[in-house]
Each structure stands twice: as C-alpha cells, then as structure tokens.
C-alpha cells in the first residue's frame, strides 16, 4: 500500500483518491480534441497542440510546463512531385501506377495537409527492374530465398509483406541483399481480421489503406545528424553522408489492391511453403520477374521525398517532489501522428492528459508526491524517438544520477480484449500488485479484478496462476531511458487475441483511417479500457513516486536472469563439439547469476527489516534500488550498437519491435554455423560470456551490505 | 441523397470537340473510381473510360484511345470527359457511373448512374 507520510497530506489523497479522480468520459473529450486535424511531426499543427498542452497542463497544476525544442533530421514528400510506382511495358510507358493517397474516410474529405503514404528517410531515385517477392523480408525470408532457392536479389526490386518484424529491419535485410529499391505492402492475412469489415464500417484495413513508418535504422542514436548528443542551436551535425541509420535505396509502401496489381504478375519460382502465401488471390510467386506474357515488363519506383532538418518541441510537465525532489519518475508519451493518430499516440496522449489532470487535482487540494513526477508529450517519435532521445540526451547527466523510472504512455489500445505489459524484471511485482487492486473492464468478469481477468486471458508461461509480462524491445519512446541510461522502464495497453501477430500492429495502424470514429465505434466507446490503462499507468506512477520504499523487487531480476542464462546455453549447446573444440564454458555466467540471486534474496531481507524512520538508511536502500537497474549498462555498448548498453536486454537485431535477453551473446551465436572464421566467431562468443558474467556480477554486489 | 448529373451535351460537328460535365452529391468523389459509358441509339452499352479515385490511373475504350481524356476535379465534386477529333459513331447518351469499390485500382462494376447526357455528331 501506498504510505503518504512526510508529504503534508491529509489522508484521503492517496492512490485512491488519484484513481478515482480518472474519468473515462474526460479521457474520451481529450481524444476528440487531439485527433480533428493531423499533427505530423515538424508541422505548425504540432506546434500548437504543443502549446495547448502546455497550457492546459499548467491549468491542471503543475509547477511548470517548459517547452524543449531540437532541430532534427525529418522526411517528407515532395508535394508538387508525389511519390508512386509504376509498371512499364518494353518501351517504357507507364501502364499502371500505385495510388497517391488513400481514399480519405468520410467527413475528413476537406482535410488538408494529410501526408500521402511514404516511408520517411527513403532516399530519392527511379530504379526500375524485376519484382522479387521477399514474403516479410526477415533475416530467415532471405536465408530461405539466398541459402535454399538460390535467388539472387542483386540489383532486383524487392515486395515484402508489412508485419512480424519492424520496417527498418526489412529495409536493411533487403539493402544488404543487394536489393535496388523496396516496396512495402500490407497483406490481408495480417492486416483483415476475418469476419470483420473494413473502415468505416469496421476496423479492418480496406484496399486503399497504406500503412506510413520511417524505415530508419538508428540503434538508439536519436536524431541522424548528432548522435550521442542534443539537436541543440550550437550542434554541429553530420554531413548527410555520415548520418545515422538512413537507408541507401528507395522504398515505397501500398496497400493491398496495389499490391494485388504488382504481385498477380509474378512469375519465376513458386513460393517455397504455405508460409509465404498471404490471403490475396495472387500465386505469391518469388521471381524474379513476371510470368511469361508480361516478361518484358519492369517495375519502376518514382520516390521524390525529402530530407531536412526541422524543429520539434517536447513539452516537459514537473510535479516537485516534497520529499525527494531530486529523484524522477518520468510518464512519458508522444504527441506526433502520422495523420489523425487516433490511436498511435492520441489514445495514449489522451490517458496522459487525463492523468496530469488527476495528480493536478491532488495537488490544489494540498497534496504532493514524495518524489518528483515529470510529464513528457513527446515530438518525432515518428521519425525515430527523436524527441524523448534529445531530451535524454541533453538531461543525461540528471537523468543518470535522479532517474527511478519511466512509464511509457503511446497507444493505449491496439485491441481490447486483455491488458499487455513490457517492463523490467524490477516492476513485476508493482504491476501484479496493482493489477489486483484495480477492477477489470473485460465482459464476464465484472467484480472481478484486472489480474484474475488478465491472467485467465493471458497467462505466464512459465508460472501458473501468474499473467505474460513480456522484455522490453523498442521502437517506443522508453529506448533511451531503459536501453542506453539503465533506468528502469514499463508500458502497459490494452491488446488484442492475437499472440501469433504481435508485431503487426491492429489493421489500421498509421493509416488515414485511425481517426477518433474508429476508437470511439469500434475498439471502445465506452472507454473503459481507456480508463483501466489510465489506472494501470497512472497508478504505477502514483506508486513509484510516491511509495516510501521503493516497488522495485531484485528478486525477479535474480528469476529471470537464471532463466536467460538456461536459454542462451541451450542455444549454443547446439554447437557441442566447437564448444568443446574452443573450450567455451557458460560456468562463469551461472555462478553470477547464483550469485546474485543469493545477495538480492539477503537485500530483500534487509529490505524487511532495515528503520524506515531513518531517512539516511532509507535514502541508502532506495539508491541501490534505483541503480540496479543501472547497474547492468555497459559503457561501451554492444558491439557496432554503442548506444544500446543494457547487457540482459536490447531490441533484437533482426526486429527492433522485440526484446531479446543477453544480446551481446545471442548475436555472436547468431548463424555461427556460416562464419568464415569460426575461431574468431567463438572467441567473440566467450568474451560476450565474459562480459555478461562480469556485469551481473557486478549489478549483484551493487546490492551487497555497502560496507 | 446520391446522385450524378451529366452536363455538356449537344449536336457537334466531325471532327470537333466537346467535354463533358458530371456534378456528383451525396458522396465524395476524392473516394471513388468513376466511369464513363455511352449507348449509341438501338444499341447496347459500352463502357468508354475509368479513372481511379487518386487521377493516377486511366483506362479507355480501344475506340476513344487517344481522342479522348477523363479527369476531375475532386475539390469540384466533379468528373470531366474532353472528346477532341468526335466522329459520327460517337453520337450517343453518355452516362457517369460511380465505381463500387472505394478506392479501386482498376474497373470493376457501376454502383451509381446518372440520367445521361445526348451527344450527337452529325455535319
């Protein structure tokens, strides 16, 4: 529970109080008002709605809402010069093209400044030539095509299928290939849940929909131009060629009716298994080329967009703490949109608004949080996390030493049939014990709580009774605070049933047509789960910043790191006889982890026992809390990815979406198979051992008895 | 309620030109795929031109290939035929016909008609 001593309080402000101050029917009107005209990142429309929030969230009560602007690297299309793919015929005339904008949803039809479809950061260029069909261009799709088929993507353009990975990695894997140019498409089979209409009669994806993203590849770098450091007035940036992550060839997505136009063609090889066939009524034929009557047609991409270095504004609300001011427990979403972003990010950014006003409220009736809460609407996270990651970059120094935690706060649905929380092994018991305390909105479970409903639908799979807490991976603004910083980080939304999709994102993800009639008719118009996200975010923070002790359990650190510790082991043991061979030994790892379960078992017992009315002992306690988290970044980074430095986790390699757990290790194995010097490749895999085996050895005795 | 209006008919001689109007209510046109088809006196129908919704795609009838040109103008709720170099099997009532799939790629069946305008051409 919730202790409010030392905070000048009277004793009905406590969690209770901040819940139930939180009104679905508030969360609703900030939706509408976020989402009536698009707010693209670097536009005068996100200008001022950067404005209004920091308005609005002063009249709420904060102490000060500051505006934190950057000059970074965005993407656009040329509006006088639109992007499209064509296909030729022998003699080069165009005899059909792609479309060049989606059919816009009904009443936004006199909307103006709606961005076509585009991948941001394509380079410009017109290459023309045979179609290769890539299925959803993952690292495996082109092991099966290069390895297994023999197909040769050098200088081919290559059509992959939206979905299972995240865009960028689709676009490297394809660079690296040999590809010419990328076309992206979104397949019914992952994007049109059966029995289900189409927009605006459902929230399935209709033909014209295109699904926009940037297609970076930053590792963590923020914006392109100054990596390591703050898009400030004094930067100095990188020439272009020297930027961060941009990739070298010209991609462009569709929707599913161009691609049916693209992909019926096709002709070469036939699609290897049932697994590289979507729902379109096409042959899903690899290539390269198209069948025999229409072999002298090419296809030609016509990408015409932009890079340029604009301004962006974060807008940075602080609670002061009453007791601990110098320690920050950060919520933080992104305010930038696509078109309308009636899902990504206003469902989120409207959950925020809702919850600075709660704690706003707490706060005139006298109340303030022990330690201190800052709130982040953050810019460009479109563009990859650009805006929280210059702000990190800038406030690292702070952020390093003050940092409890950071609660994301992007969509709050993309479905809405169960909660789904990422978030450190620390939080684990935070968000089981609140989740407990806060009711269910779920049909058939109505008195019963959000963990009972939470776990029947979504159980652990490893702990029965337990509910599926997943790593933290990116491609969400908490990258820089949990993966580069070491600050302990969750998020928390509601899902849908669809655990073999989990990467695909809902049918109208940054679509035109994620606009506040598709939440408000389709996925929750009573906004109750709205609501319960709200609870479980809000809640966190409330609990984080304001419990005595800190809610952070080292014990389920010590859990799952036996358990990564087994799964990286049986993944090289697949290697017995180099393992044997180059003498490499997982002993030293599982020692460390014995280790530090051992120690973190004795810190929770001191943990019990040690006088909370000592606030020097109390200050000690909470710092090696805090700073466990801390403890597992290694300055020097991963290897070729400086600005991931967590050792237990990073966004996997081959999907920036998902988390993987001893990455530096996993990636040494890696297809260690094919490496050319296998000497090499398992000396790389020992001295990763060595230096996961060292840094839980030393987050351990950051939790020993300090003298 | 839904409708089409087809406007800019009339007697033209071989050879000369005339365009054609098509005011569409009810709906936006920025969403759809339109058509136009034509019946000559005692004859059938027959389809003459599609443009997709976007203006990025345009199919024509091998008789009227390179005479003659659909457009619109999405802000104008309007559809356009332009015939340059008329002949006299052209004389016919020309119809717009909405296309039934929003956002279409390619020709596919008539949803919405209208009540037709009467070119005729004739010396």
């Known amino acids: 529970k919730s202790s409010n001593e030392a905070t000048n309080i009277t004793p009905k402000h406590n969690m209770k109080a901040f819940l139930d101050e939180l009104k679905a029917e508030n969360i609703k009107k900030f939706l509408y008002n976020f989402t009536q005209i698009p707010h693209l990142a670097g536009t005068e429309q996100n200008f001022q709605l950067a404005k209004q929030i920091q308005s609005q969230w002063k009249e709420f009560g904060l102490d000060s809402v500051e505006l934190a602007h950057y000059d970074v690297l965005l993407s656009y299309p040329n509006k006088t010069h639109p992007n499209y793919i064509s296909i030729i015929n022998e003699d080069g005339n165009e005899i059909f093209n792609t479309s060049l904008f989606e059919p816009p949803p009904p009443g936004y039809e006199n909307v103006s400044d709606i961005v076509p479809p585009f991948s941001a950061f394509s380079p410009q260029g017109m290459p023309e030539g045979d179609l290769v069909y890539v299925n959803y261009a993952r690292t495996e799709d082109f092991f099966k095509l290069e390895r297994d088929m023999k197909i040769n993507c050098s200088g081919k353009i290559v059509i992959a299928r939206y979905g299972k990975v995240f865009r960028g990695n689709k676009v490297k894997n394809a660079q690296l290939a040999g590809a010419k140019g990328v076309i992206l498409y979104s397949d019914p089979a992952d994007y049109f849940a059966p029995g289900v209409k189409s927009y605006p009669d459902g929230w399935n994806l209709p033909g014209g929909g295109v699904q926009r993203g940037n297609i970076l590849n930053l590792n963590g770098a923020g914006d392109p131009l100054t990596p390591g450091y703050p898009a400030n007035e004094y930067a100095y940036r990188r020439g272009i060629a020297e930027a961060v992550g941009l990739p070298s060839i010209p991609v462009h997505p569709i929707g599913y009716y161009d691609a049916q136009k693209l992909l019926e063609k096709m002709g070469g090889s036939a699609p290897p298994d049932s697994s590289w066939r979507g729902s379109l009524k096409v042959p899903y034929n690899v290539g390269p080329g198209f069948t025999g009557n229409f072999s002298t047609q090419k296809v030609k991409m016509h990408i015409h967009s932009t890079n340029e270095v604009t301004r962006i504004y974060n807008v940075i609300g602080t609670l002061r703490g009453a007791v601990e001011p110098d320690r920050y427990v950060i919520l933080g979403g992104h305010r930038d949109s696509w078109v309308f972003g009636g899902i990504d990010p206003q469902s989120g950014a409207a959950v925020v608004h809702e919850i600075v006003r709660s704690f706003g409220t707490l706060k005139k009736e006298g109340w303030r949080p022990r330690r201190t809460i800052l709130f982040a609407s953050w810019d460009a996270e479109e563009f990859g996390l650009l805006g929280s990651t210059e702000w990190a970059e800038e406030n690292s120094r702070l952020l390093q030493e003050r940092g409890v935690a950071y609660i994301n706060a992007d969509s709050s649905i993309e479905g809405n049939y169960t909660l789904r929380v990422d978030c450190t092994p620390l939080m684990y018991s935070l968000v089981h014990n609140l989740t407990k305390e806060l009711k269910s909105p779920d049909e058939g479970f109505e008195g019963k709580s959000l963990y009972e409903s939470w776990t029947k639908k979504s159980p652990s799979p490893e702990f029965s009774g337990m509910p599926r807490i997943s790593k933290l991976g990116s491609g969400n603004d908490f990258e820089v605070f949990f993966q580069r910083l070491g600050i302990a980080s969750g998020r928390a939304r509601y899902t849908k049933n669809w655990e073999t999709n989990k990467f695909s994102g809902y049918p109208l993800y940054h679509s035109v047509y994620e606009t506040y009639e598709l939440v408000e008719k389709f996925y929750d118009p009573m906004f109750k789960y709205h609501l319960t996200v709200a609870q479980v975010r809000g809640g966190m923070v409330f609990e984080l910043a304001n419990s005595i002790v800190l809610p952070f359990d080292c014990r389920d650190y010590a859990v799952v790191l036996r358990k990564y510790a087994d799964k990286i082991y049986s993944i090289s043991m697949k290697h017995p006889q180099e393992m044997k061979t180059y003498s490499v030994s997982f002993d030293s790892l599982f020692s460390a982890v014995k280790n530090f379960t051992e120690i973190a078992s004795k810190f929770s017992e001191r943990l019990q026992d040690f006088d909370k009315s000592n606030p020097i002992v109390l200050r000690m306690m909470n710092d090696q809390l805090m700073f466990l988290e801390r403890a597992f970044i290694d300055p020097l980074g991963l290897p070729d990815r400086p600005f991931y430095r967590h050792v237990i986790y990073a966004p996997s390699s081959h999907n920036k979406y998902a988390g993987e757990s001893f990455p530096g290790i996993y990636d040494a194995l890696f297809d260690i198979e094919s490496k050319v010097d296998p000497s090499k490749a398992w000396g790389e895999v020992k001295r990763q051992i060595y230096v996961a085996a060292f840094t839980v050895q030393a987050a351990a005795e950051t939790l020993s008895e300090v003298a | 309620q839904v409708q089409l209006v087809e406007s800019g008919g009339g007697v033209v001689q071989p050879g000369r030109s005339l365009r054609l109007s098509c005011a569409a209510s009810?709906?936006?046109?920025?969403?759809?795929?339109m058509h136009w088809v034509r019946q000559a006196p005692g004859k059938g129908l027959e389809w003459v031109a599609f443009?997709?919704?976007?203006?990025?795609?345009?199919y024509y009838a091998d008789a009227v290939k390179g005479r003659f040109t659909i457009s619109r103008d999405n802000s104008k709720n309007t559809l356009y035929l332009q015939m340059n170099s008329l002949r006299a099997e052209d004389t016919a009532v020309y119809y717009c016909?909405?296309?039934?799939?929003?956002?279409?790629?390619?020709?596919?069946?008539?949803?919405?008609w209208g009540q037709g305008t009467m070119v005729t051409v004739s010396s």
């Open positions: 443009q997709t919704y976007d203006g990025s795609n345009r």
């Open positions: 009810g709906f936006p046109l920025i969403s759809y795929g």
């Open positions: 016909a909405r296309d039934r799939i929003v956002g279409g790629r390619v020709p596919d069946a008539f949803d919405i």
